[in-house]
Structure formats: structure tokens, C-alpha cells
Amino acid sequence: PTDAPVSPTTLYVEDISEPPLHDFYCSRLLDLVFLLDGSSRLSEAEFEVLKAFVVDMMERLRISQKWVRVAVVEYHDGSHAYIGLKDRKRPSELRRIASQVKYAGSQVASTSEVLKYTLFQIFSKIDRPEASRITLLLMASQEPQRMSRNFVRYVQGLKKKKVIVIPVGIGPHANLKQIRLIEKQAPENKAFVLSSVDELEQQRDEIVSYLCDLAPEAPPPTLPPDMAQVTVGPGLLGVSTLGPKRNSMVL
């Protein structure tokens, strides 16, 4: 489960810089949710490779509350959140937590339930409207039909909240019907269908590039209106305030 909210006295360390680990490094405004299939359709070893992929992706993102925020959820018949979007931890600590997600190996992994959880828990309030919202649905199994009655409704609900859903089908048991339904809902909902977890590493750069391209770059930093900046012009010293409609004063 995710930690309790940070108290005002908590030291905020997640912006203490950790150098990029790779040449490609996504510095965009993005809220990214990883949903990991916890069914027995993946063996424990395959699930370890799935987690390695998530950690690999996280290494290529500029994770912080200002740039890329991440959530990590393992789903079976319910959902287990390991990292929340608002968790204020160092990127290395978040990667460590992701690598320790427990293998459930359950009979069922309900995509409907986890999309419902994403819609009503993770994106219940949109607190960063300027950021793109993307859910990476890593799926290797098929939920029973009785569980999927509201599947389309949840996908449409996510679309209304401008949440892009990118399904990644893994192996022979992934629910291709649901993947196609997700793709139909929005042009950005691009699917990746892989024959096994071994292909995750080969597709990783393409997937992370696709996600990154969907997110906006941060606007250039602006100084607050009341902040004065001393400027030296040709032959005169001026003080210009960067606020709107303010004239420079000549000293």
C-alpha cells in the first residue's frame, strides 16, 4: 500500500538531483500509471522480467513531482497500489519499491477492476491539468466475462478525464478483444502486442518514446510579476520588472 500523506515536517528529498542513467531521458509533464498483471498466466520468473521492464522504463523518466509522476499498481481480482502519484521519494527509492512488487499468481487479473481503480482512485481529482495522463496497462491474461461488463464504461470514463490508455498485451493469453476495444476509444490509445516478456526489453525504447511524445514540455520558467531584474542597456542602467505593462525606470 502507498504511504500516508507526507506531513509538513517531512524532508522533501525527491528533487535532490539524481543524474540521468541513460542517453534518452524523458523530461516532460506526465502522470504515468503502470498496471501490472498479477495473474498466474505469468510465471513468477516472467513477473520478475515484467518488473524489470517497469524499472527500466522508470530509469528513462525524469521522475519528480514537477516532471514525471509515477504510480505502480499490481492487479489481480483487486488492485494493490505500491506507488502513488503523490509519493515524494527519490527516483532510486521508487525504482526499488517497483522492483519489490510481490507476485500474486492469482487465477484472475481483472482489467475492468484495475481500470475502475485508476479512474476513481488514481485520477479521481485532476490536480495537474497541465500534465498528460497515461496508463500503461500490462496485460497477460483474460478476465472472466462476468467481470468485464463495465469494461468499456471505465475506458470511456478515462477518456473523458483525458487519460490515455496504452495496452501492452504479453503472451498468448492476453485479451486481444479488450486491447482492440481500448484502441478504438481514442487515436492515442496505441497498443503493443508482444509474444512474451522477452520482447518487453526490445520494445522498451519505442514504448517510452511514444509515451514521452504524448506529454507536453514544461513552459519556460517565468519570474513572478513583482520580481525586479537589473538590466544593462546601451549606455544606461535600467531596472525592468517582468510583470505585465510595467515601464522600466531609468535610474
Epitope: A45, E46, V49, A52, V55, D56, V197, D198
Partner: nanobody, 116 residues
């Protein structure tokens, strides 16, 4: 069919070390995640360590900090360096492909016995 040949097991005292090797003849090796498993007498086979094609590793809690998995793609071989061995590490150790569809038939494995 792809074959896997494990070696390097033996009898070792508690606190000792062994390095296991697992060689395969497959062209698919370099693009495949590999894993070491072990099975103690009368118990189920358990996952010990995995390594992806890119070299990212993971370990069972019981061996973290003591065992190291590695691979040499040029030699189509995966290794398991085992340090600070304990009597509870006694088992038959097997390696195999992680992905079910690629999995080779389970071989004889290599016996590791930790005893004083």
C-alpha cells in the same frame, strides 16, 4: 530441441562458495531472460534468480546479497555465484528460460550440498 547443461555443484561447508554454470546450444539465448531454480528434497521447485537479456537481475529474498546471477552471451552461458552458503541452500539447482514457450525440458540439474 534446446538443451541446457548445468555444472559446478558439489559438497561445500557452511560459509563456503560455489559457482554454477549453465550452457545452452540455442541461438535464442542472447534475446532470452534466464533463471536459476532449485528444488530441495521433498519440496517444490523455487525461483532463485532471474536475469533479463539486457542483464537486469532479481533474486529471491532468501539469497539476496549472497548469490549473483550473470550471463555471457558470447558463450551462451548463465552463471550463479553462490557465497556464504547455508545448509538450507542444499538442493538440486537447475537453469532454464524464463518464458514458458521457450523452456527446455528440465535436466538433471546440479546437486549442491552444504554441510559440515
Amino acid at each position: 530441441a534446446v538443451q541446457l547443461v548445468e555444472s559446478g555443484g558439489g559438497l561445500v561447508q557452511p560459509g563456503g562458495s560455489l559457482k554454477l554454470s549453465c550452457a545452452t546450444s540455442g541461438s535464442i539465448f542472447s534475446s532470452s531472460a534466464m533463471a536459476w531454480y532449485r528444488q530441495a528434497s521433498g519440496k517444490q521447485r523455487e525461483l532463485v534468480a532471474t536475469i533479463t537479456s539486457g542483464g537486469r537481475t532479481s533474486y529471491a529474498d532468501s539469497v539476496k546479497g549472497r548469490f549473483t546471477i550473470s550471463r555471457d552471451n558470447a558463450k551462451n552461458t548463465v552463471y550463479l555465484q553462490m557465497n556464504s552458503l547455508k545448509p538450507e541452500d542444499t538442493a538440486v539447482y537447475d537453469c532454464n528460460f524464463v518464458v514458458d514457450g521457450k523452456r527446455a525440458p528440465w535436466g538433471q540439474g546440479t546437486q549442491v550440498t552444504v554441510s559440515s
